[in-house]
Structure formats: structure tokens, C-alpha cells
């Protein structure tokens, strides 16, 4: 006759508050005759969790039909789990006896522990923008998880980062834990469209990690390059001068023209275009009247980008005698 084995396959069962826990128990033999009961804890003070034949256990249901002949599955489900339900659960076989049934064999036990899912990771970037080639720090926080074991990874555009530091608090026993990680990211000029991702993996997430993201567009400032050029062709007695402001981010930009140090108030034509990398180009045209102009006209294009110190480019206007003749010819 085969010796009875009580099989409880899970050593640890993580459950979430409010959910249903399934505790597995199978037997390898139908003998001896007698019931299988579920207890939490051991010794005389152990708590009866389920007795099929008598008592009131409204939160407990059986996984299979215990009344079926030759049933060997005594697994149970406990609904509406609360923190009070944690502990080690044992399925115990009793042999029918008189006056009392006699405990025959116990399963090894399944420890039920509360598993709490981590909150969605929140990623925060630096307070101020930084230019490319510099390093910025991003922090990622997630709270309220249990057990303490957790994995956090950082990615930049899908590439895993290695320069980060992570802390899980508290260090001792607790009902819930928090994680905080700080990653150091070197900014590239093309990072306007880049993202950093903080990925959190935890046993309660069943292989589906949580992610928090931050756009590097919030952290980067790409300063513009300036070029001032004079167009070779003139329109009547006017020469067209162009100021090209290239590859800047963010869009916030103020452009002013000065003629021989005097700020010009008149309207100028301009266009804004966005580059594939997310940076912007700004082109401004300035028409200079060359009739009776001296040769020493200096034009300045000054740009104040994102509240930074102004940068400027100057152009000494080249007006040839030929151009002067043309302009005087054009004057009625």
C-alpha cells in the first residue's frame, strides 16, 4: 500500500489585498479514511481555515469537488484577502477515530505573504536645462510594493544605462517598500527627441514591468549657431541681409537687428522651420536702404535664446560703386 504524501507545491504564495488566494494541496493515496482539514499555523493554537464537513467558512471554496469519489485534490480558495490572512497554511489529513479523529499527516505548508504592486514609476529630470556634452541627473521613484525584492533598469532610447544608483527603503522589515534611483545621462546634441525610461520589475507584476518616462526635450538646451550673409542681388535700392539661426532648442528666441549699433524697430520677414532631430532653424531677412549710404554700414543680428546671454553676429555691408550707381540710376 502506497504511503500517503501530502503535497503542497508552493513554499511561498504572494497575494494582493482584496484578491483571492489559491492554496494547493493534493494527496497521493485515499487511505487512511478520514478528512483533510486546512489550518493556519501549528500547535494547539492553530487556526482552522477549512473543514468541509462542519463549521462556517464563508470565504473558503474548494477548487475541486471534494465529494467526488477518489478525489485527491484538496486545494482551497480564500477570497477577499486582508493583511490578517498572512501566515503558513497546512493541509492536514486526519484518520477517523473514536472519540476524536486523529491527525495522521500534514503537508509541508505554504507561506502566504502579502504582495503589493509598486506604484507607476515617476521620473523627474533636472530643474534647469543643460547643453549637450554635459551630464544631467534623472530620478525615478516607485512606492508601496512588497516583498522588498525589486529590479530597476534605466534606458535611453532603448539602450540600457549603467551609470545609476538605487536605494530601497526601509532596509528592515516593513509592510511596504519604496525605491528611488538616480541615473546620470550625458546629453547629445540630437537628444531633443530622446527619452529616458525607468523600468521596474516585481514579482507581483507577473513579468509585465512598469515604466516611467521622461523626455530629454525638457532637460536639454541646444544653443544656436548664427550666420549673417548679404544677398548678392539687390531689390531696387535695397540690399537683403539674412541672419540664419540654426539648430537651437527650445523654440524660445528673440532676434533683433542693429544698424551701426542702433536697434532697428521696423518689421522684418522671418521663417521658423523644425529639423528632423527636433531642433529649430530661424531665418530673418533685413532690407537695408543703400541709397546715399556710406561704405561703413555694420549690421548686427543679435539672438537671445531661452533666457541666456545674447549672442550676435556682425556683417560689414559691402556696397560697391557699381551698386551705388545702380541705386542712383534707380532713383527718379
Amino acid at each position: 500500500e502506497e504511503e500517503l504524501q501530502m503535497i503542497q507545491p508552493e513554499k511561498l504564495l504572494l497575494v494582493t489585498v482584496g484578491k483571492t488566494a489559491t492554496l494547493h494541496c493534493t494527496v497521493t493515496s485515499l487511505l487512511p479514511v478520514g478528512p483533510v482539514l486546512w489550518f493556519r499555523g501549528v500547535g494547539p493554537g492553530r487556526e482552522l481555515i477549512y473543514n468541509q464537513k462542519e463549521g462556517h467558512f464563508p470565504r473558503v471554496t474548494t477548487v475541486s469537488d471534494l465529494t467526488k469519489r477518489n478525489n485527491m485534490d484538496f486545494s482551497i480558495r480564500i477570497s477577499s484577502i486582508t493583511p490578517a490572512d498572512v501566515g503558513t497554511y497546512y493541509c492536514v489529513k486526519f484518520r477517523k477515530g473514536s472519540p476524536e479523529n486523529v491527525e495522521f499527516k500534514s503537508g509541508p505548508g505554504t507561506e502566504m505573504a502579502l504582495g503589493a504592486k509598486p506604484s507607476a514609476p515617476v521620473v523627474l529630470g533636472p530643474a534647469a536645462r543643460t547643453t549637450p556634452e554635459h551630464t544631467v541627473s534623472f530620478t525615478c521613484e516607485s512606492h508601496g510594493f512588497s516583498p522588498r525584492d525589486i529590479t530597476l533598469k534605466w534606458f535611453k532610447n532603448g539602450n540600457e544605462l549603467s551609470d545609476f544608483q538605487t536605494n530601497v527603503d526601509p532596509t528592515g522589515q516593513s509592510v511596504a517598500y519604496s525605491i528611488r534611483s538616480t541615473a546620470r545621462v550625458v546629453l547629445d546634441p540630437w537628444d531633443v527627441r530622446s527619452q529616458v525610461i525607468c523600468e521596474v520589475a516585481h514579482v507581483t507584476l507577473q513579468g509585465d514591468p512598469l515604466r516611467g518616462t521622461a523626455n530629454l526635450s525638457e532637460a536639454i538646451r541646444v544653443p544656436p549657431t548664427l550666420e549673417v550673409t548679404q544677398q548678392p542681388m539687390r531689390v531696387g535700392n535695397q540690399v537683403n541681409v539674412t541672419c540664419q539661426v540654426r539648430k537651437f532648442y527650445p523654440q524660445s528666441l528673440q532676434l533683433t537687428w542693429s544698424e551701426n549699433g542702433n536697434v532697428c524697430q521696423r518689421e522684418t520677414a522671418s521663417t521658423l522651420t523644425e529639423n528632423k532631430d527636433g531642433t529649430y532653424n530661424w531665418t530673418s531677412w533685413f532690407l537695408v536702404n543703400i541709397s546715399d549710404q556710406r561704405d561703413d554700414v555694420v549690421l548686427t543680428c543679435q539672438v537671445k535664446h531661452d533666457g541666456q546671454l545674447a549672442v550676435s553676429k556682425r556683417l560689414a555691408l559691402e556696397v560697391t560703386v557699381h551698386q551705388k550707381d545702380q541705386s542712383s540710376d534707380a532713383t527718379p
Epitope: P44, G45, R46, E47, K53, E54, L66, E100
Partner: antibody, heavy 113, light 108 residues
């Protein structure tokens, strides 16, 4: 819905035997212990015994041992309690209950000469 | 056998008052096996509290149960008119199963 319907009131003479039935519906009695409880007029509850209808195993309180027989018929889903050698102090309401949670309405047994 | 002694035998209180009913066992009873029943005249007992402290379905939250070992208590925080009845404690920890003699909760 779980229901336990007991047989009607009985009047018996001392020394006689009474057999009370408890018909169950909404569940199979084979799956539960069926208990019997006595309540004498103006007195408290007293556990008589129980049966496991699955294998007819019984347990009785020492006070009733030898005079009481609890049986069950799983084909009709009915439990029975038979009390013999009746005496006046057996005058009481007898309740059946399923696994200590659901109770029948009670059967009054009057023992009088 | 385990003898359950309930006290007081009768408790006279007014609606709104707090009621404390005690049940003392002659030997230790695991909390899982201590139940309370309510019974009103002419009615069958009703399961009221199971496993020492768990309220049966539909029982108002003003009722609570506590205790361990040999001393158990049923408490009603603020009595309502429908609470006046007889309450029995019951152990099914070992055979023979036993009941306390009951506490009659009556209106003062």
C-alpha cells in the same frame, strides 16, 4: 438555498420511542455532518450528537449515549434522530443542524402519560 | 467534557447602552471552534459569530466577538431593540460539543 425541514410535533408516553426526520434541500447531506440539539422548555441548548452521512459514522454526547440513534438516508437527503426509553425530562424541542451553521425549525416532543 | 459558563445569566439594559456577555471555558478552546448563537422566543438559534470574532452574514457591525483560551466575550456597542434575545456560546473543539447555559439580554 439551504433548507432543513423537520417532521411535526409528537406526543409520546414514557418508555416509548420517537423518531424525528430532518429533510434537507439546497445541498447534499453526504457532504456535511448533521447534528442534533435538544432544548427543554425554558432551558438552554444541549448537543445530542452528529452523523457523517457519507459513511454513517456517529458521535454522541455521554448523556444520550445508549438511548439515541442518529441515522441518515442519502437517497432521500434526510437525517433522523431516534430517542428511546422516553421520560418526562425528554420533553423538548429537537433541532437538526447542518455543520453548526444552518438549523431546522425544530420539532416539539412531549412525553406525558 | 468542556463546560462553558456564561455570565451574567440575565443582563438588563436599555437601548443605546453597551452590552458585554462573557463565556468561560473549563479548558482551553481554540478560537476557531468558539461560536455564538442568537435565539429569540419560538425560533431556532441563528449563527451570530463564528471563530470567536467573525460576524455571520448580515449581522450588524455593532456586534463584536473577542477572546482566546478560556475566556471569550460578545460585545454589543449600542443596543438596538431587536438585539434583545438569548445568546449562547458553543464550542466544537472536542467531543462532546457543548453550549453555555445562555445569557438572556432583556430590556430594562
Amino acid at each position: 438555498e439551504v433548507q432543513l425541514v423537520q417532521s411535526g410535533a409528537e406526543v409520546k408516553k414514557p418508555g416509548a420511542t420517537v423518531k424525528i426526520s430532518c429533510k434537507a434541500s439546497g445541498f447534499n447531506i453526504k457532504d456535511y455532518y448533521m447534528h442534533w440539539v435538544q432544548q427543554a422548555p425554558g432551558k438552554g441548548l444541549e448537543w445530542i450528537g452528529r452523523i457523517d452521512p457519507e459513511d454513517a459514522e456517529t458521535k454522541y454526547a455521554p448523556k444520550f449515549q445508549g438511548r439515541v440513534t442518529i441515522t441518515a438516508d442519502t437517497s432521500t437527503n434526510t437525517a433522523y434522530m431516534e430517542l428511546s426509553s422516553l421520560r418526562s425530562e425528554d420533553t423538548a424541542v429537537y433541532y437538526c443542524d447542518r455543520g453548526l451553521a444552518y438549523w431546522g425549525q425544530g420539532t416539539l416532543v412531549t412525553v406525558s402519560s | 467534557e468542556i463546560v462553558l459558563t456564561q455570565s451574567p445569566a440575565t443582563l438588563s439594559l436599555s437601548p443605546g447602552e453597551r452590552a458585554t456577555l462573557s463565556c468561560s471555558a473549563s479548558s482551553s478552546v481554540s478560537s476557531s471552534y468558539l461560536y455564538w448563537y442568537q435565539q429569540k422566543p419560538g425560533q431556532a438559534p441563528k449563527l451570530w459569530i463564528y471563530s470567536t470574532s467573525n460576524l455571520a452574514s448580515g449581522i450588524p457591525a455593532r456586534f463584536s466577538g473577542s477572546g482566546s483560551g478560556t475566556d471569550f466575550t460578545l460585545t454589543i456597542s449600542s443596543l438596538e431593540p431587536e438585539d434583545f434575545a438569548v445568546y449562547y456560546c458553543h464550542q466544537w473543539s472536542s467531543y462532546p460539543y457543548t453550549f453555555g447555559q445562555g445569557t438572556k439580554l432583556e430590556i430594562k
